[in-house]
């Protein structure tokens, strides 16, 4: 006999990276008929929701109106149908960004590179941090971690046209508190000598999304957030 229900799916809307003082919604999707959802933060009960009518609702939302470092951390949720509880969801790492300072990002040999060359991103932040994160915008969001006193190197390559895209870096004060994002660096990769055409870029967020990623949920972020979250959060762990 089944002792637990399938685990629910947890995510953050519009994004798991939340600028401080902005709002975020944590969503938990379980099953129709669930009478209670519990949101846990860092292992302790954080919030409860009892959907009405339960048979018509399979998802609840927990609203955080004002993000700060105390709200950043690992969230999970569970739900109950009758007396039977579900398995806990995967962990959601909620990150507060725009803390303290803005790093600078440079790329070597430059923003326009040739397929086959090796590329190094350098991220620098003078305030006290030792961990840096390099993020590539887009559907197949790549996140790299680097370490250094004030600067970290992120080697890439040999590059292909798949490396094309917009990169930003963050300084990380801990796993869940990140700096402001750096200015973007757009990496262009031309083909080899025989084929100098540029391949299509990875599907990316609309151009204005990054700066307003907490102000709208109508930019296509909703469709991509699960992929982004999964990649980035595996890295966080």
């Amino acid at each position: 006999q089944q002792q637990t229900l399938p685990k629910p799916f947890i995510w953050a809307e519009p994004h798991f990276m939340v600028p401080k003082e902005k709002q975020v919604t944590i969503c938990c999707q379980g099953n129709y008929g669930a009478v209670e959802y519990q949101l846990h933060f860092e292992g302790s009960l954080f919030a409860v929701d009892r959907p009405k009518p339960p048979e018509r609702i399979n998802k609840v939302k927990f609203y955080i109106p004002d993000m700060n470092s105390r709200m950043a951390g690992q969230y999970s949720c569970i739900y109950r149908v009758g007396e039977l509880w579900s398995e806990p969801s995967n962990l959601l790492d909620l990150v507060v960004t725009e803390m303290y300072d803005t790093p600078t990002l440079s790329v070597h040999p430059g923003p326009e590179v040739i397929s086959g060359e090796k590329v190094t991103f350098y991220c620098r932040l003078d305030t006290a941090t030792s961990m840096f994160l390099l993020l590539k915008e887009g559907r197949s969001s790549h996140v790299q971690r680097g370490y250094g006193k004030v600067q970290a190197e992120f080697p890439l390559g040999p590059v292909t046209t798949a490396h094309r895209g917009t990169y930003r870096c963050f300084g990380s004060y801990n796993n869940h508190a990140w700096s402001f994002p750096s200015e973007p660096v757009k990496l262009l990769v031309t083909g080899d000598i025989e084929n100098t055409s540029l391949a299509p870029e990875d599907p990316t967020f609309p151009a204005d999304t990054w700066g307003t990623y907490l102000l709208t949920t109508e930019t296509g972020l909703q469709k991509d957030h699960a992929l982004w979250d999964h990649t980035a959060q595996n890295l966080l762990r």
């Epitope: 600078t104 990002l105 440079s106 070597h108 040999p109 430059g110 040739i114 397929s115 086959g116 060359e117 090796k118 190094t120 350098y122 620098r124 600067q151 190197e153 080697p155 390559g157 040999p158 590059v159 000598i193």
Partner: antibody, heavy 115, light 107 residues
Framework: QVQLQQPGSVLVRPGASVKLSCKAS????????MHWAKQRPGQGLEWIGH????????NYNEKFKGKATLTVDTSSSTAYVDLSSLTSEDSAVYYC????????WGAGTTVTVSS | DIQMTQSPSSLSASLGERVSLTCRAS??????LNWLQQEPDGTIKRLIY???RLDSGVPKRFSGSRSGSDYSLTISSLESEDFVDYYC?????????FGGGTKLEIK
């Protein structure tokens, strides 16, 4: 066209420091890396480090950490390498080179360390 | 650090001859390799970048190629001004490193 102007030569005393300059023109100074390299008489080239004038990000060959400090003055489009505690081993030609792929090279400055 | 082993260290050849210089990389550097030419007065000029791309203004007799971890500079028909020093340089992984150089002498 791109020009990287370096002083021809400089004579310094052992134990002293020297600041070598590389004045750039013909391109946007803040958009390209600036590298420095050393060549001892009759020897090959060694990379000292590089700096990005826009971000101030610099990176050094471990061998030259504590010996060389790279800086830039964006207002005059000039890059500098500061060499400290000079010994006869530091007598060499020092080159600046523009761009991540070392696109263009200065003519080099000959540093002679002698009492 | 990546070692760049350049060979030969010196080479005697005749005008009109075809010669090849080689650099072997100790680690993968992709196509991040330059060939530089140094005149007797110390002037350095880049000839080839990204393994095989010819710089503008460089004569077509110069060409670059790669076979695995071996990178070659070929001069198809030597002219008098080619008898100078040549260096390879990898810019794949910091610290960027140079080959030991090849002195090309006239026979």
């Amino acid at each position: 066209q791109v020009q990287l102007q370096q002083p021809g030569s400089v004579l310094v005393r052992p134990g002293a420091s020297v600041k070598l300059s590389c004045k750039a023109s013909g391109y946007t100074f803040t958009s390209s890396w600036m590298h420095w390299a050393k060549q001892r008489p009759g020897q090959g080239l060694e990379w000292i480090g590089h700096i990005h004038p826009n971000s101030g990000i610099s990176n050094y060959n471990e061998k030259f950490k504590g010996k060389a400090t790279l800086t830039v003055d964006t207002s005059s489009s000039t890059a500098y390498v500061d060499l400290s505690s000079l010994t006869s081993e530091d007598s060499a030609v020092y080159y600046c080179s523009r761009g991540g792929r070392f696109d263009d090279w200065g003519a080099g400055t000959t540093v002679t360390v002698s009492s | 650090d990546i070692q760049m082993t350049q060979s030969p260290s010196s080479l005697s050849a005749s005008l009109g001859e075809r010669v090849s210089l080689t650099c072997r990389a100790s680690q993968d550097i992709g196509s991040s390799l330059n060939w530089l030419q140094q005149e007797p007065d110390g002037t350095i000029k880049r000839l080839i970048y990204a393994t095989s791309r010819l710089d503008s203004g460089v004569p077509k007799r110069f060409s670059g190629s790669r076979s695995g971890s071996d990178y070659s500079l070929t001069i198809s028909s030597l002219e008098s001004e080619d008898f100078v020093d040549y260096y390879c340089l990898q810019y794949a992984s910091s610290p960027w490193t140079f080959g030991g150089g090849t002195k090309l002498e006239i026979k």
